[in-house]
Interface confidence: low
Amino acid sequence: GELETSDVVTVVLGQDAKLPCFYRGDSGEQVGQVAWARVDAGEGAQELALLHSKYGLHVSPAYEGRVEQPPPPRNPLDGSVLLRNAVQADEGEYECRVSTFPAGSFQARLRLRVLVPPLPSLNPGPALEEGQGLTLAASCTAEGSPAPSVTWDTEVKGTTSSRSFKHSRSAAVTSEFHLVPSRSMNGQPLTCVVSHPGLLQDQRITHILHVSFLAEASVRGLEDQNLWHIGREGAMLKCLSEGQPPPSYNWTRLDGPLPSGVRVDGDTLGFPPLTTEHSGIYVCHVSNEFSSRDSQVTVDVLDPQEDSGKQVDLVSAS
C-alpha cells in the first residue's frame, strides 16, 4: 500500500484546514492508528493527535478543541484530520504516521500554509498645492502572509515607490504615490489596489485628490463700452476666477470709495442707474487660503449728449 496526501495545504487565516492522509491499501489491509505530529525543522516533533482504530481520537492538550476527524461517513483507511480556525502559528510542517497491518508503518509529510489576508490602510500625504514639485499624494500599507501586492489605479500621472518590511511570519508592503500637483487633478480618484492569494478579490481604497489653486482673475461686463452711458440701468461687473478651496471676492475702487448705491454681491458689482460719478477704476480682489489675485478695470460712463456733439463736429469737420 501507499499513503496519499498533499505536499502543501493552503488555508486562509481563520478557516478550517483539512490535513489529508489516506492509506491506499491492498485487500485485507487495515489501519491500526494514525499519529499526527508537527515536525518543523530545528524543533522536536510535537504530538498533535492520535486516531486509534479502537480507542478513537486522542488530541494533544495544546490542540484541544481544534483537531477533529472529518464528519461521517468515514473510511477506516482515512487518517485525515481537521484543524479548526487556522492561525498563523499553525503554519509549518506536519507528519502523519500510519501503522497498518500486516504491511507495517508508513509516513508522509505536508506543509500547512496559512494565508493572512492584508488589511490595507491609505494615508493621504501633505496638502497638495499647485506649483509644488513632486509631492507625496498618498501612501498605502498592507501587511500579510505572503507579502501582498500593492499597486495604484488612477488616471492621474505620477510615480510610485514601494518598500517591504519582513517580519517573522508576514511582510508589510508600503507603496507611495507621488505627483506634481495641478488643478486638473482636483476631484480625481487615486485608488490603492491590494492583491493577495488570501483575498477573493482585490481590496481597493480610494482617496479623492484635492489640489489648492487660484486661477487668474478677470472682469466681465465691459465688453461693450457703449452700454456704459448715463442713465443705464442694470449695469454690472462680474469677477471671474476659480479656485480650490472656492475663493471669496472683494470689490474696491482704486480712486476712492465705492459710490453710494453700488451693491456688492460676492463676485458681482451691481450699479444703480449710471452717472458720471460711477466712472473710475474698480478692483476685484480674489483670495482663498492658497493665494490671492487682483484684476482691475476702468469704467468710463459716457454722456450720450457729449458723444453726439462730438459726432456732429466730426461730420462738419469733414
Epitope: D7, V8, T10, D40, A41, G42, E43, E91, G92, E93, R111, R113, L115, S145, P146, A147, S149, K166, S168, R169, S170, A171, S195, P197
Partner: nanobody, 121 residues
Framework: EVQLLESGGGLVQPGGSLRLSCAAS????????MGWYRQAPGKEREGVSS????????RYADSVKGRFTISRDNSKNTLYLQMNSLKPEDTAVYYC??????????????WGQGTQVTVSS
C-alpha cells in the same frame, strides 16, 4: 527544499528576442508570487518583472514595459520571461526569485543561480 533553475540566456543582437525559463520545485508554486531580477556588471540587482500565483497580475519595471512579458505555467511549475526588442542595456545576469514563508523561519527570498543575457552587435 526550494529549488529554482534558470535557462534560456545567451548572446543576441540588439532588437532580438530571448525567452528565459525557470523550473521551480519545493514549494507551493501555484500560490507563490514569483519574479525576475537582473544584475548588470558593477550594478545592484534590480527587479525586472513579477507575477502573482494565479498569473493574473503582472508588474514590470519602466525600463522593460512593452518589451518584456512574464508568464507562468503552474502545471509545469515553470516561470517564463519573453524578452523582445532587446537593447545593450539589457545585458545582465537574470535571476528567478520567489518568496516563501515556511513555519517559523524567515526564509523569504529564494534565488536561482542565474542565466547570462548579453545584447551586443
Amino acid at each position: 527544499e526550494v529549488q529554482l533553475l534558470e535557462s534560456g540566456g545567451g548572446l543576441v543582437q540588439p532588437g532580438g528576442s530571448l525567452r528565459l525559463s525557470c523550473a521551480a520545485s519545493g514549494f507551493a508554486f501555484s500560490i507563490d508570487a514569483m519574479g525576475w531580477y537582473r544584475q548588470a556588471p558593477g550594478k545592484e540587482r534590480e527587479g525586472v518583472s513579477s507575477i502573482s500565483g494565479s498569473g493574473g497580475l503582472t508588474r514590470y519595471a519602466d525600463s522593460v514595459k512593452g518589451r518584456f512579458t512574464i508568464s507562468r505555467d503552474n502545471s509545469k511549475n515553470t516561470l517564463y520571461l519573453q524578452m523582445n526588442s532587446l537593447k545593450p542595456e539589457d545585458t545582465a545576469v537574470y535571476y528567478c526569485d520567489t518568496a516563501v514563508l515556511t513555519g517559523y523561519s524567515e526564509a523569504f527570498d529564494y534565488w536561482g543561480q542565474g542565466t547570462q543575457v548579453t545584447v551586443s552587435s
